[in-house]
């Protein structure tokens, strides 16, 4: 069972909902984006891998007051099975490289889509 | 309330193109996931495709490569096209309601039948 | 895709019957199942969901019972209303899929 706290769910759903769910947050933040993203702030990029859940999270999480990604952040915490907090960085494999959030955020919605394409849900 | 209502041509050539569209009343289509869903006759029901609130869509597999779905907002309305038909798409199309996070059709057009025949 | 297989295929009751409707999915579906109805002519209508929720407006002799893979339909005393095709719908993982249907017929 998925199961994302705060307002994002009402409840468990099945993994692929949730997929949905996150993939069509993602696209309301890339349509509605007027001035930059989290006033273009960087964050890790991230191995589109196993563990990507966990590590985007743990990438994005290290965003504070940007409102428009709140709600992906709780939305990727149903997903990722241990409490992520800032500044820890147990899933991010490769810190190497810090691109802007509104890049993060394109790269990991052209991933999930293609994940749901592929019915990879889990 | 939201109510669904579909409309279209009821007979198709072979080989054409199916163009059907759902009006939706009551609510905005601007929220939740718009779907097809089709009942060939005597048969069971198959799921088509829907588009979301945002305008994205997903398409079933085995049939994603005949498929577009679109919408108008400023009408409230989707549409469904589906190329290259034959006799085997022929059956009764509902368009259906599916309100976020959830997974079941809680609300469905009467339908309406499409035979495709030369 | 996951395939959904009901049985029986068709059923002849006769009011105040008690009857049993089963759905089984080819691969562990939790409880992401849903019941419909549908008459002749008409759009089908959703009756339950998550295997065991009625819908809104649904009388409560419809139930619904299972998880992983084997789910169950009853309903506790048929009335006049309820001969129709009943059908079960996966939500797991797309595509959604539906079950063949159950007709129940007036014995």
């Known amino acids: 069972l998925t199961c994302l706290g705060g307002f994002a769910s009402p409840g468990p759903v099945p993994p692929s909902t949730a997929l949905r769910e996150l993939i069509e947050e993602l696209v309301n933040i890339t349509q509605n984006q007027k001035a930059p993203l989290c006033n273009g702030s960087m964050v890790w990029s991230i191995n589109l891998t196993a563990g990507m859940y966990c590590a985007a999270l743990e990438s994005l999480i290290n965003v504070s007051g940007c409102s428009a990604i709140e709600k992906t952040q709780r939305m990727l915490s149903g997903f990722c099975p241990h409490k992520v907090s800032a500044g820890q960085f147990s899933s991010l494999h490769v810190r190497d490289t810090k691109i802007e959030v509104a890049q993060f955020v394109k790269d990991l919605l052209l991933h999930l889509k293609k994940l749901f394409r592929e019915g990879q849900f889990n | 309330e939201v109510q669904l209502q579909e409309s279209g041509p009821g007979l198709v050539k072979p080989s054409e193109t199916l163009s059907l569209t759902c009006t939706v009343s009551g609510g905005s289509i601007s929220s939740d996931y718009w779907n097809w869903i089709r009942q060939p006759p005597g048969k069971g029901l198959e799921w088509i495709g829907y588009i979301s609130y945002n305008g994205n869509t997903y398409y079933n597999p085995s049939l994603k490569s005949r498929v577009t779905i679109s919408r108008d907002t400023s009408k409230n309305q989707f549409s469904l096209k589906l190329s290259s038909v034959t006799a085997a798409d022929t059956a009764v199309y509902y368009c259906a309601r599916l309100a976020k996070w959830t997974w079941y059709f809680d609300i469905w057009g009467q339908g309406t039948t499409v035979t495709v025949s030369s | 895709d996951i395939q959904m297989t009901q049985s029986p295929s068709s059923l002849s009751a006769s009011v105040g019957d008690r009857v049993t409707i089963t759905c089984h999915a080819s691969q562990n579906i939790n409880v992401w199942l849903s019941w419909y109805q549908q008459k002749p002519g008409k759009a089908p209508k959703l009756l339950i969901y998550?295997?065991?929720d009625l819908h809104t407006g649904v009388p409560s002799r419809f139930s619904g019972s299972g998880s992983g893979t084997d789910f169950t339909l009853t309903i506790s005393s048929l009335q006049p209303e309820d001969f129709a095709t009943y059908y079960c719908q996966q939500g797991q993982s797309y595509p959604y899929t539906f079950g063949g249907g159950t007709k129940v017929e007036i014995k």
């Open positions: 998550k295997a065991s």
